[in-house]
């Protein structure tokens, strides 16, 4: 006889990276007929929802109206059908951003490179942090960690056109509290033989559209909660 129900999916909308004082919704998707959902934060019960009518609902939402560092951390959820509880969901790392300061991001040898050249990103932040994160925009929300007193290096190795895209970095005060994002750097990779010297390191869009990026770039992942769950879970491990 089955002792537990399958684990639910957990994700954050619009994104697991939440600017401070902005709103976020944590979604938990279980099964139709679940009479109770529990959201746990850092291992303790945080909130409970009892959907009505349970047979018509398989997802609940826990709304956080005002994100701050106390709300940042690891969330999981479980649900109950009758007396039977589910396995806990994977952990969702909810990150508060726009804390304290803004790092600067530079790329060597420059933002326009030729396929096969080795590229290194440098993220610098003068305030007290020793961990840095480099993110490339796009579906996979690929994150690299780097360490250093005021700056960190992110070597990409010999680049291909797959490395094309817009990059930003953050300083991390702890695993779940990140700085403001840096201005974006758009990396252009060409296979052509052409003079790319002194190609300006222009931002592709201003910093205030970062919020829009958070709302839009993970759409594909939100449609596939399993993949999104996996991405969020592995981000900070």
């Amino acid at each position: 006889q089955q002792q537990t129900l399958p684990k639910p999916f957990i994700w954050a909308e619009p994104h697991f990276m939440v600017p401070k004082e902005k709103q976020v919704t944590i979604c938990c998707q279980g099964n139709y007929g679940a009479v109770e959902y529990q959201l746990h934060f850092e291992g303790s019960l945080f909130a409970v929802d009892r959907p009505k009518p349970p047979e018509r609902i398989n997802k609940v939402q826990f709304y956080i109206p005002d994100m701050n560092s106390r709300m940042a951390g690891q969330y999981s959820c479980i649900y109950r059908v009758g007396e039977l509880w589910s396995e806990p969901s994977n952990l969702l790392d909810l990150v508060v951003t726009e804390m304290y300061d803004t790092p600067t991001l530079s790329v060597h040898p420059g933002p326009e490179v030729i396929s096969g050249e080795k590229v290194t990103f440098y993220c610098r932040l003068d305030t007290a942090t020793s961990m840095f994160l480099l993110l490339k925009e796009g579906r996979s929300s690929h994150v690299q960690r780097g360490y250093g007193k005021v700056q960190a290096e992110f070597p990409l190795g010999p680049v291909t056109t797959a490395h094309r895209g817009t990059y930003r970095c953050f300083g991390s005060y702890n695993n779940h509290a990140w700085s403001f994002p840096s201005e974006p750097v758009k990396l252009l990779v060409t296979g052509d033989i052409e003079n790319t010297s002194l190609a300006p390191e222009d931002p592709t869009f201003p910093a205030d559209t970062w919020g829009t990026y958070l709302l839009t770039t993970e759409t594909g992942l939100q449609k596939d909660h399993a993949l999104w769950d996996h991405t969020a879970q592995n981000l900070l491990r």
Partner: antibody
Framework: QVQLQQPGAELVKPGASVRLSCKAF????????MHWVKQRPGQGLEWIGM????????KYNEKFKSKATLTVDKSSSTAYMQLSSLTSEDSAVYFC????????WGQGTLVTVSA | DIQMTQSPSSLSASLGERVSLTCRAS??????LNWLQQEPDGTIKRLIY???SLDSGVPKRFSGSRSGSDYSLTISSLESEDFVDYYC?????????FGGGTKLEIK
């Protein structure tokens, strides 16, 4: 026309410090890396370090970490390298080179360390 | 640090001759290699970047290529102003390092 302007020569006493300048013309100074390179008389080239004027990121050759300090003045589009505790080993020509790939070079400053 | 072994250290050749200079990298540097030219007065000019990209204003007789960890600068037909010093430079892994140089002399 991109140009990197460096003074021709500096004569300094042993134990003293010197600040070398490199003024950039003809491009957006803040957008590109600036490198510094050493060449001893009749010898090859040695990379000292680089600075990104916009971000303030610096990267040094470990060999020169306690010898050289790189700074910039964005308002005058000038890069500086301070060399400290000078000895005869520091007598050399010092070049600045603009752009991550060393696209443009200054004429070099001859530093002579002599009592 | 990555060692760049440049050969030959000096080379005597005649006007119109085709010559090749080589740099061998001790570690993988991808295509992150420049060739530089230094005149007797100390002036340095970049000829080639990213292994094979010719700088604007550089004569077409100069070309760069790669075979594994060996990088070559070829001058297809030597002219009088080519008899100067040449250096390779890798910018793949910090500290960026130079080859020991090749002195090209007229025969």
């Amino acid at each position: 026309q991109v140009q990197l302007q460096q003074p021709g020569a500096e004569l300094v006493k042993p134990g003293a410090s010197v600040r070398l300048s490199c003024k950039a013309f003809g491009y957006t100074f803040t957008s590109y890396w600036m490198h510094w390179v050493k060449q001893r008389p009749g010898q090859g080239l040695e990379w000292i370090g680089m600075i990104h004027p916009n971000s303030g990121v610096t990267k040094y050759n470990e060999k020169f970490k306690s010898k050289a300090t790189l700074t910039v003045d964005k308002s005058s589009s000038t890069a500086y390298m301070q060399l400290s505790s000078l000895t005869s080993e520091d007598s050399a020509v010092y070049f600045c080179a603009g752009d991550g790939r060393f696209a443009y070079w200054g004429q070099g400053t001859l530093v002579t360390v002599s009592a | 640090d990555i060692q760049m072994t440049q050969s030959p250290s000096s080379l005597s050749a005649s006007l119109g001759e085709r010559v090749s200079l080589t740099c061998r990298a001790s570690q993988d540097i991808g295509n992150s290699l420049n060739w530089l030219q230094q005149e007797p007065d100390g002036t340095i000019k970049r000829l080639i970047y990213a292994t094979s990209s010719l700088d604007s204003g550089v004569p077409k007789r100069f070309s760069g290529s790669r075979s594994g960890s060996d990088y070559s600068l070829t001058i297809s037909s030597l002219e009088s102003e080519d008899f100067v010093d040449y250096y390779c430079l890798q910018y793949a892994s910090s500290p960026w390092t130079f080859g020991g140089g090749t002195k090209l002399e007229i025969k």
